[in-house]
């Protein structure tokens, strides 16, 4: 039976999750290393391609699932990139921080793909200037 709703990860959800898992963290996934990727070749798919290889790390499972959904529904954002830096590995937390910085930067500078992204960007800008994350 189909769901009465068709949820998709929104950019504000992705940004909030990336903030959540990197805040006050020196490392993620026990310092696991992943391939560095060119985020400009399609940030969702490129980041997913690298992070999908990390297993047994519950901290990034939600991020992986969001990226998977975003990558599959946004072909305009670029498919899996062949431009991987196979000679460069970085820590998971560094890749996640790079992704967070890149997502914020793209939308701060107005590189939108439609009205929904403009709306999301406005929320992201608010988020950046007023964000106070709560921990248990």
């Amino acid at each position: 039976s189909p769901s009465p709703v068709t949820p998709s990860p929104t950019l504000k959800e992705l940004i909030e999750e990336l903030v959540n898992i990197t805040q006050n963290q020196a490392s993620l996934c026990n310092g696991s290393m992943v391939w560095s990727v060119n985020l400009t070749a399609g940030m969702y798919c490129a980041a997913l391609e690298s992070l999908i290889n990390v297993s047994d790390c519950s901290a990034i499972q939600r991020t992986q699932r969001m990226l998977k959904a975003l990558c599959s529904q946004k072909p305009a954002a670029g498919q899996i990139s062949s431009e991987r830096s196979r000679d460069t590995k970085i820590e998971v937390i560094q890749l996640v921080k790079n992704l967070l910085t890149y997502v914020r930067g793209v939308y701060r500078h107005g590189n939108f793909r439609g009205l929904n992204d403009i709306f999301e960007a406005q929320k992201i800008e608010w988020h950046e200037h007023h964000h106070h994350h709560h921990h248990h």
Epitope: P4, E13, R62, A69, I124, H134
Partner: antibody
């Protein structure tokens, strides 16, 4: 038609244990994250626990952490909530609910609930 | 932990507009979902991702989200809309619900 049917609710003394079950039908159970939400008599909704589709990740509300365990058997299309060291303030109707997102966000279908009463 | 604040009750005359607020710290950065619950029944999702209506939910229900406040609006409230309404967000690795608002429709 999506259906979620809870069972296992009962009256129990403080410190006791109960195991709730939720049998799902009308959808591919193994593809959905699931959760438990409770509602004390005359009170509001309170999320209790959730579990990823494959059971690889779980999370709990602070009020039940260390006492309750959520699990699932995808072969039986069944969600469970093991409740140990029950307290009077755990008295509530317990609802089983489905999350249509793969990452965890909201609930689109709910069961009718099963009543748990903890009293001495 | 993240807290969502709702008024305990809202009263509206029949066929008038009812507005139910849901306050939270920078709630604008979150996706807000709304549920309707009638006495003795399970909750029903009526708005998701701030302003989207699930199939089967009447057009009179709408949602918005800005600043520190999300709002559920019921335009032309009917007697059948009398119920408890809950807002919900995802925060701190879990589902957070508001305290609930009892809507009374007069007339």
């Amino acid at each position: 038609e999506v259906q979620l049917v809870e069972s296992g609710g009962d009256s129990v003394r403080p410190g006791g244990s109960l195991r709730l079950s939720c049998v799902a039908s009308g959808f591919t159970f193994s593809r959905y994250n699931m959760g438990w939400v409770r509602q004390a008599p005359g009170k509001g909704l309170q999320w209790v626990a959730w579990i990823y589709d494959g059971g690889s990740r779980t999370s709990y509300a602070d009020a039940v952490k260390g006492r309750f365990t959520i699990s699932r058997d995808n072969a039986k299309d069944t969600l469970y909530l093991q409740m140990d060291d029950l307290r009077v303030d755990d008295t509530a109707v317990y609802y089983c609910a489905r999350d249509p997102s793969s990452w965890g966000s909201l609930f689109d279908y709910w069961g009718q609930g099963t009543l748990v009463t903890v009293s001495s | 932990s993240y807290v969502l604040t709702q008024p305990p009750s809202v009263t509206v005359p029949l066929r008038q507009t009812a507005r139910i607020s849901c306050g939270g710290d920078n709630i604008r950065s979150k996706n807000v979902h709304w549920y309707q619950q009638k006495p003795g029944q399970a909750p029903v999702l009526i708005i998701y991702n701030d302003s989207n209506r699930p199939t089967g939910i009447p057009e009179r229900f709408s949602g918005s989200n800005s600043g520190n406040m999300a709002t559920l609006t019921i335009r032309g409230a009917l007697a059948e809309d009398e119920a408890d309404y809950y807002c919900q967000v995802w925060a701190n690795d879990g589902y957070v619900f508001g305290s609930g608002t009892q809507l009374t429709v007069l007339g």
